[in-house]
């Protein structure tokens, strides 16, 4: 469209904002127990981990920001069973880390989840 | 709990992860039109803006990460009305930016929204 009143430096600020909102891997706080689907008597310390997940905006409503490539990173967490019958166990938990994202049509698709040990 | 068999370096890594997952202001991509509750014939370019919003984990299920202090920052965006009857207008949009967060009891509370112009 014709930018009758807009100088380039003003548009560049808007453009930089636009770039930063684009669909891309973003550091996200993920709750381990809910992602693992663990029973209510199992807890993790820390309860959350930081991983990269796809997020941000797509410029069309018919598109959604989806992961196109994934790596799995191992996080060391304490697994605690209640009632506390033994010393909390230090366990490795493999977490899906999105390494590539793309705006894709909103067809139903199974999201990547955490794969345990 | 007693970490009977865990060396200090392992515990430090876990602790750092824990700190990074705590409830705090995090850069977030916010869709302007849905936050403003604008009519479906009004669009914004860029459609999203980056602001800080409270996010992360609270260590108890009864608590939720909520904002305790907020500033409002102005973003310059193009407002486009469809059908396109005039040149898109560059408008200032004031967006809530969370500056402080706390884990608070999950009592019903109205979220902060965008205040327009």
């Amino acid at each position: 469209f014709a930018a009758t009143f807009y100088d380039i430096e003003t548009l560049k600020v808007i453009d930089e904002e636009w770039q930063r909102t684009q669909c891309s891997p973003r550091e996200t706080c993920v709750e381990v127990a809910s992602e693992l689907g663990k029973s209510t008597n199992t807890f993790f310390k820390p309860p959350c981990v930081n991983v990269f997940r796809c997020g941000g905006c797509c410029n069309e409503e018919s598109l959604i920001c989806m992961n196109t490539s994934t790596s799995y990173i191992s996080k060391q967490l304490f697994e605690i069973s209640v009632p506390l019958t033994s010393v909390p166990e230090l366990v490795p938990v493999k977490v899906a880390n999105h390494t590539g994202c793309k705006c894709l049509p909103t067809a139903p698709r199974h999201p990547y989840s955490i794969i345990r040990r | 709990f007693a970490a009977t068999f865990y060396d200090i370096e392992t515990l430090k890594v876990i602790d750092e992860e824990w700190q990074r997952t705590q409830c705090s202001p995090r850069e977030t991509c916010v869709e302007v039109a849905s936050e403003l509750g604008k009519s479906t014939n009004t669009f914004f370019k860029p459609p999203c803006v980056n602001v800080f919003r409270c996010g992360g984990c609270c260590n108890e299920e009864s608590l939720i990460c909520m904002n305790t202090s907020t500033s409002y920052i102005s973003k310059q965006l193009f407002e486009i009305s469809v059908p396109l009857t005039s040149v898109p207008e560059l408008v200032p949009v004031k967006v809530a930016n969370h500056t402080g967060c706390k884990c608070l009891p999950t009592a019903p509370r109205h979220p902060y929204s965008i205040i327009r112009r």
């Epitope: 469209f1 014709a2 930018a3 009143f5 807009y6 100088d7 380039i8 430096e9 003003t10 548009l11 560049k12 600020v13 453009d15 | -």
Partner: antibody, heavy 116, light 112 residues
Framework: EVQLQESGPSLVKPSQTLSLTCSVT????????WNWIRKFPGNRLEYMGY???????YYNPSLKSRISITRDTSKNQYYLQLNSVTTEDTATYYC??????????WGQGTSVTVSS | DVLMTQTPLSLPVSLGDQASISCRSS???????????LEWYLQKPGQSPKLLIY???NRFSGVPDRFSGSGSGTDFTLKISRVEAEDLGVYYC?????????FGGGTKLEMK
């Protein structure tokens, strides 16, 4: 390094349309702003307008509704059209990039004479 | 429109001289973002303009340090500490803060 090259007819008849192409190498239209400037006989420079990598355009009001700037990202080219030319439009026409700093790279320029 | 007035129109120099060109804008050219987009270009005979100085005082890549820019608000100056033969040509100031963008009328740096 980015390079720009203007091309088009060197002679245009009055009332006709002046059409020029700017070919860009060493950069793509995924960022930056692409401009047209002209230099009249006697050295005066006039800023004509720009097209952004998103397709946003701006035209100098002095050119009224005679000007149009378009682009073809697949060819890494952008274009200038100036309608209803008169002898006053005789000038050397330059394309230039506005990158991180204003008008940092220019084409060599193409001389256009408007005459019957 | 912002009128950019350059003085002098012509500047005769000898090699090794210091040269000073003035550019005055008809209104402040401080952009709403706080920056001042005042640029200096040199056009040598048969060539296109080349960027020398951007945002008042920053030398563009490859520009020798004998070129310096200064000023604020509406008054700006380009200085060449020791003129060399390759510096001859027409110098233009340009404001990129307010549309339509405008150029000064040019200053011809020539041999005495």
């Amino acid at each position: 390094e980015v390079q720009l090259q203007e091309s088009g007819p060197s002679l245009v008849k009055p009332s006709q349309t002046l059409s020029l192409t700017c070919s860009v190498t060493g950069d793509s239209f995924t960022s930056d702003y692409w401009n047209w400037i002209r230099k009249f006989p006697g050295n005066r420079l006039e800023y004509m307008g720009y097209i952004s990598y998103r397709g946003v355009t701006y035209y100098n009001p002095s050119l009224k509704s005679r000007i149009s700037i378009t682009r073809d990202t697949s060819k890494n080219q952008y274009y200038l059209q100036l309608n209803s030319v008169t002898t006053e439009d005789t000038a050397t026409y330059y394309c230039a990039r506005w990158g991180t700093v204003p008008l940092d790279y220019w084409g060599q320029g193409t001389s256009v004479t408007v005459s019957s | 429109d912002v009128l950019m007035t350059q003085t002098p129109l012509s500047l005769p120099v000898s090699l090794g001289d210091q040269a000073s060109i003035s550019c005055r804008s008809s209104q402040s050219i401080v952009h709403s973002n706080g920056n001042t987009y005042l640029e200096w270009y040199l056009q040598k005979p048969g060539q296109s303009p080349k960027l020398l100085i951007y945002k008042v005082s920053n030398r563009f890549s490859g520009v020798p340090d004998r070129f310096s820019g200064s000023g604020s608000g509406t008054d700006f100056t380009l200085k060449i500490s020791r003129v060399e033969a390759e510096d001859l040509g027409v110098y233009y100031c340009f404001q990129g803060s307010h549309i339509p963008y405008t150029f000064g009328g040019g200053t011809k740096l020539e041999m005495k």
